[in-house]
Interface confidence: medium
């Protein structure tokens, strides 16, 4: 009798639908070739296919097998009009699985899914299931047609991880799930505003998002020129304002406010605000004569371009005299004063058009 082939190996590619059949050749010499048959088992509906290949071949392929259907595959050794007993095995070609599932349009209560519909006439649609990560029972399930490549899952909880699966469906079978995990967003606050700006303080307000389950708000702030130097404040969810203190004068800050919902943060609401200039301090007078004196002060912390000094007799309603000095100086001698008169002297630090609060002192000639 003819010896059958040995070591039958079946491999179905779910993406292409191609079944590859391979074997080790018969030990019988001078055979004509091999006959390979694929037949649905147990009388299931489906194509029965047959191939005959040359004796020097040890594999062949079949197209158009129905995924999810069980096939019996047999390979016979053929010599002229004789056949060996077959070597046989069964295989169920897998239902093709999505390979390019991705998430789009993520909000606090919805996640959009996108994929490329598979090009196979046997696919009748897709099943979408949603499970809260760590839970077993799907909280949501829906079916879409085979031509559909987009779906929005709605009614989700904010800031929660969801395992979302898309399963390819055929008549009487389905693919393994393509599963990805995605977290819904936490709704951010809106309408960031800055008020009560001082040299080292500012009040930050925002509109809370429409949520009553927030854990807190996170306010982060840092100088624009040194964003690594970040300070962070946790604010009660019932508050929508905070006063930032101990800031650097004349410094632009970047401020962000995020909603926090059970350890999950929203995208930050960001804004920039510059603190005011601080005043010069420590006004002092020296070299007092009948018609002159020298005014001294300590420079402010802020970066400035110069100072404006005004002076006038104490009970004088006219325009004061004005002098300007560069930022490198911290004294000025006022001359041509009236003897025996009390003068009011005010000093303002300048940075371009920006002015600090006044530093005021009084001195008599």
């Amino acid at each position: 009798p003819l010896s059958p082939p040995t070591n039958l190996h079946l491999e179905a590619n779910p993406d292409t639908g191609v079944l590859t059949v391979s074997w080790e050749r018969s030990t019988t010499p001078d055979i004509t070739g091999y006959r390979i048959t694929t037949t649905p088992t147990n009388g299931q509906q489906g194509n029965s296919l047959e191939e005959v290949v040359h004796a020097d071949q040890s594999s062949c392929t079949f197209d158009n097998l129905s995924p999810g259907l069980e096939y019996n595959v047999s390979v016979y050794t053929v010599k002229d009009d004789k056949e060996s007993v077959p070597i046989s095995d069964t295989i169920i070609p897998e239902v093709p699985q999505l390979t390019d599932l991705s998430f789009v349009d993520i909000t606090d209560s919805s996640i959009g899914l996108r994929w490329t519909p598979l090009n196979s006439s046997t696919i009748i649609g897709y099943r979408i299931t949603v499970v809260a990560a760590g839970e077993g029972i799907p909280i949501f399930e829906d079916f879409v047609d085979s031509s559909v490549g987009y779906y929005t899952v709605t009614g989700l909880e904010p800031g929660i991880d969801y395992d979302i699966s898309v399963i390819t469906l055929i008549n009487g079978g389905e693919s393994a799930p393509t599963t990805l995990t995605q977290q819904t967003a936490v709704p951010p606050p809106t309408d960031l505003r800055f008020t009560n700006i001082g040299p080292d303080t500012m009040r930050v307000t925002w509109a809370p998002p429409p949520s009553i389950d927030l854990t807190n708000f996170l306010v982060r702030y840092s100088p624009v020129k040194n964003e690594e130097d970040v300070a962070e404040l946790s604010i009660s969810p019932s508050d929508n304002a905070v006063v930032l203190t101990n800031l650097l004068p004349g410094t632009e800050y970047v401020v962000s406010v995020s909603s926090v919902y059970e350890q999950h943060e929203s995208t930050p609401l960001r804004g920039r605000q510059k603190t005011g200039l601080d005043s010069p301090t420590g006004i002092d007078f020296s070299d007092i004569t009948a018609n002159s004196f020298t005014v001294h002060w300590i420079a402010p912390r802020a970066t400035i371009t110069g100072y404006r000094i005004r002076h006038h007799p104490e009970h004088f309603s006219g325009r004061p005299r004005e002098d300007r000095v560069p930022h490198s100086r911290n004294s000025i001698t006022l001359t041509n004063l009236t003897p025996g008169t009390e003068y009011v002297v005010s000093i303002v630090a300048l940075n371009g058009r920006e002015e600090s609060p006044l530093l005021i002192g009084q001195q008599s000639t």
Epitope: T107, D108, S109, A132, G134, E135, I137, I139, G155, L156, E157, P158, I160, P187, P188, T190, D191, A207, P208, P209, P210, S211, I212, D213, S238, E262
Partner: antibody, heavy 123, light 113 residues
């Protein structure tokens, strides 16, 4: 069809206690936040209490008017919602509705209401 | 707390008439991030429990007749019944779900002339 059926209402004296119940059917009870809303005779609606699902650690929320006196709880295995009311006051006299929350935990509109159970606080 | 004010408190109508009722909130119920208004409308027929009609200010609940429409944004909202039927005689409540605590309006009672 989703159904919520309240029970346990009745007449109770001021400073007394009462526990009312709500049996839910036709829904996956354990996935929803549930609420109690009340309506005093010939008056409007007032939200009373809320309990979230297990995945949200059964977090509870109360109106200021009932805080520290009322306790909301649930038994997911029985699809039951409860409201334990202590130190009752005459102003707690109302029809108490068991209410399912629509949307998700940020969206507190109420899409299914029970028929209500009457609580009367009077000496 | 957000205060919800409804007007009128009662309204006498004839069957077939078009009716509008107003609901105003003490602060905006519009969330700029998603452009949604966090407002719902309920109907309470005599001796019955309330029933959800509209949410997101203008989205009709499944099964609600399309003669009921909600409109408005920010702080001013309207419920319109295009042609009143006898079964529409009820009290209508608006409710905000923008912030804690949830608050309802005092209601508008629809009565027959």
């Amino acid at each position: 069809e989703v159904q919520l059926v309240e029970s346990g209402g009745g007449l109770v004296q001021p400073k007394g206690s009462l526990k009312i119940s709500c049996a839910a059917s036709g829904l996956t009870f354990n996935t929803y936040a549930m609420n109690w809303v009340r309506q005093a005779p010939r008056k409007g609606l007032e939200w009373v209490a809320r309990i979230r699902s297990k995945s949200n650690n059964y977090a509870t929320y109360y109106a200021d008017s009932v805080k520290d006196r009322f306790t909301i709880s649930r038994d997911d295995s029985q699809s039951m919602l409860y409201l334990q009311m202590n130190n009752l006051k005459t102003e707690d006299t109302a029809m108490y509705y068991c209410v399912k929350q629509g949307g998700n935990s940020l969206y507190w509109y109420f899409d299914v209401w029970g028929a209500g159970t009457t609580v009367t606080v009077s000496s | 707390d957000i205060v919800m004010s409804q007007s009128p408190s009662s309204l006498a109508v004839s069957v077939g008439e078009k009716v509008t009722m107003s609901c105003k909130s003490s602060q905006s119920l519009l969330y700029s991030s998603n452009q949604k208004n966090y407002l719902a409308w309920y109907q309470q027929r005599p001796g019955q429990s309330p029933k959800l009609l509209i949410y997101w200010a203008s989205t009709g609940e499944s099964g609600v007749p399309d003669r009921f429409t909600g409109s408005g944004s920010g702080t001013d909202f309207t419920l319109t019944i295009s042609s009143v039927k006898a079964e529409d005689l009820a009290v209508y409540y608006c409710q905000q779900y923008y912030s804690y605590p949830l608050t309802f309006g005092a209601g508008t009672k629809l009565e027959l002339k």
